[in-house]
Amino acid sequence: IPLARTVRCNCIHIDDGPVRMRAIGKLEIIPASLSCPRVEIIATMKKNDEQRCLNPESKTIKNLMKAFSQKRSKRAP
């Protein structure tokens, strides 16, 4: 568990990708807030529940997010 801190960001390290969409169980987008002044994207991998921080500025990750949200909207009744 991360130490308590004044700034409550989650990500210490970020990946530019590539990350296969099929490998992701959950994609969490945490908007910038008073406690963390940056957007954070956390992918939970299906295989081992490993959580990876993704680079919000990366073109690959932006495309991934777009594809992920399209997939979710197709699933919705």
């Epitope: 991360p2 989650n10 990500c11 210490i12 390290h13 990946d15 940056r38 490993e50 990876r52 921080c53």
Partner: antibody, heavy 123, light 107 residues
């Protein structure tokens, strides 16, 4: 290939200050959490501090809290460790290391290490 | 802080021997364990992460196993270049902590 080169060590008197640097190349420094780990002569490894990829988060070992400051300059691909109020027990080789990044909040396991810089605190 | 206890603290072995080093955590750390090799006057080198994943470029004679509190590093057939000190390290929670090290010496 990944290269980390520490500098700034030397012999210092107790109570004085020192700034260590770690020049990084061969990977995307601005994406990487970075750590300092130290090793006293003939002893084991002790984690000192970590800083996140853009310098917002810093954690410290209890033994150095309040005296050490970790920082980074992503435009220069350089990591720093400012050490104040040096004590004899700070005598060690100081290594910088790259974060593996498997936990979303930073794993604290280390992929690559520099060659280290020796800090000797002696009057 | 989580305490890591390594055993033995040193061992003597011959080239070709199978060597096993154990590491015990003071509380459960899932599989968040790494192993490092350090040679005299050199920086540590990452061997294994996530208890059993081999770091890229590390020979397959090195393997890791375990989860929870008990972990093992095995060198299946000791080579001359493997004589070194080995450290385990937990990264389940901050601060990351290391075992005291196991020195593998030539018999």
């Amino acid at each position: 290939q990944v290269q980390l080169v520490e500098s700034g060590g030397g012999v210092v008197q107790p109570g004085r200050s020192l700034r260590l640097s770690c020049a990084a190349s061969g990977f995307t420094f601005s994406n990487s959490g970075m750590h300092w780990v130290r090793q006293a002569p003939g002893k084991g490894l002790e984690w000192v501090a970590v800083i996140d990829y853009d310098g917002i988060i810093q954690y410290y070992a209890d033994s150095v809290k309040g005296r050490f400051t970790i920082s980074r300059d992503n435009s220069k691909n350089t990591l720093y460790l400012q050490i104040n109020s040096l004590r004899a027990e700070d005598t060690a080789v100081y290594y910088c290391a790259t974060e593996r990044g498997t936990h979303y909040y930073g794993s604290g396991s280390f992929d690559y290490w520099g060659q280290g810089t020796l800090v000797t605190v002696s009057s | 802080d989580i305490q890591m206890t390594q055993s033995p603290s040193s061992l003597s072995a011959s080239v070709g021997d199978r060597v096993t080093i154990t590491c015990r955590a003071s509380q459960g750390i899932s599989s968040w364990l790494a192993w490092y090799q350090q040679k005299p006057e050199k920086a540590p080198k990452s061997l294994i992460y996530a208890a059993s994943s081999l770091q890229s470029g590390v020979p397959s004679r090195f393997s890791g196993s375990g989860s929870g509190t008990d972990f093992t590093l095995t060198i299946s057939s000791l080579q001359p270049e493997d004589f070194a000190t080995y450290y385990c390290q937990q990264y389940n929670s901050y601060p990351p902590t290391f075992g005291g090290g196991t020195k593998v010496e030539i018999k």
